[in-house]
Interface confidence: medium
Amino acid sequence: AAIIPQSSACPNTEAKDFLQNVKVNLKVFNSLGAKVSSRRPSDYLNRSTSPWTLHRNEDPDRYPSVIWEAQCRHQRCVNAEGKLDHHMNSVLIQQEILVLKREPESCPFTFRVEKMLVGVGCTCVASIVRQAA
Amino acid sequence: AAIIPQSSACPNTEAKDFLQNVKVNLKVFNSLGAKVSSRRPSDYLNRSTSPWTLHRNEDPDRYPSVIWEAQCRHQRCVNAEGKLDHHMNSVLIQQEILVLKREPESCPFTFRVEKMLVGVGCTCVASIVRQAA
């Protein structure tokens, strides 16, 4: 990804100023209303054939300050008998997310936007068997 | 929801002003560098026992403008023989993400931050059997 100077459709907006002076209105937040905020944590992490644990990633200078990162519990998947199936692998599903990071010692508060790659949960896939040539 | 400083080291920062006048520096973007942007889409969506499809959600007035939303292909999971297993359910793993939406006709450019709930992939869970009382 790259950010490079250019002219702007807004008159008198210099690229160098623009980059550091984008205003963000943080008042309006949920595009899906209560559907987002009220949702309960799911129990899929325990019930899945590729169960996972959630690890707390906390940074008080970031929004969201707490991000829960998934890690698969096993390398293999759990079969109907509760045993590990050596033909099936638990793999991490990852998602790229945006976060706001507070610039150190900035007054007034200034944030930068960052991308993070986070594990969201695990799924079960058939092992790929490599055939000898 | 709003982002409000918990204890403000900056004097005279009123929350009401703060919310609408947060500056965001767009110069620094990838916290993980090339690890994020260059990563290839995974083939897990086809190889999973709970396969999914990706649907394109496109909005040129949003960043990211293209978001891929997962939907489980089947209500059940696929077993080793490639048949649907009626004791196992495919369920959607969802993640809350932040997006930037451009405020209409704003000069200089002003953005609002929104939360979206997106499907990231699917996992396979044992069906919950409800016992009769």
């Epitope: 990804a1 | 767009l26 040129p60 949003r62």
Partner: nanobody, 119 residues
Framework: EVQLVESGGGLVQPGGSLRLSCAAS????????MYWVRQAPGKGLEWVAS????????YYVDSVKGRFTISRDNAKKSLFLQMNSLRAEDTAVYYC????????????WGQGTLVTVSS
């Protein structure tokens, strides 16, 4: 998957002309501002030109104004850069890039096409 494929680069003498093309796929081409950017040997990325979604407005870096013309064909999902009166300092790899609402930010650009201006 978003794809941008540039073509049309090559070796040209000072004062000569080239026309670069970019074929886009994987997104709604007509909904996005598009850009040409370049990277000279040993230098950083430099924005060259941009064009609005409907082609109504174009913007150029000062050093190419009057010499380069950006255009687009939304029906064919194509972006073009007509380069006239080329100079040695225009030597660079030229990339086509898809714009985002963040006007200075690119998530996607092509593999680039090399333009060499030399006698």
């Amino acid at each position: 998957e978003v794809q941008l494929v540039e073509s049309g680069g090559g070796l040209v003498q000072p004062g000569g002309s080239l026309r670069l093309s970019c074929a886009a796929s994987g997104f709604t081409f007509s909904s996005y501002r598009m850009y040409w950017v370049r990277q000279a040997p040993g230098k950083g990325l430099e924005w060259v030109a941009s064009i609005e979604q409907d082609g109504s407005e174009e913007y150029y870096v000062d050093s190419v104004k009057g010499r380069f013309t950006i255009s687009r064909d939304n029906a064919k999902k194509s972006l073009f850069l007509q380069m006239n009166s080329l100079r040695a300092e225009d030597t660079a790899v030229y990339y086509c890039a898809k714009g985002e609402i963040l006007p200075l930010y690119f998530d996607y650009w092509g593999q680039g096409t090399l333009v060499t201006v030399s006698s």
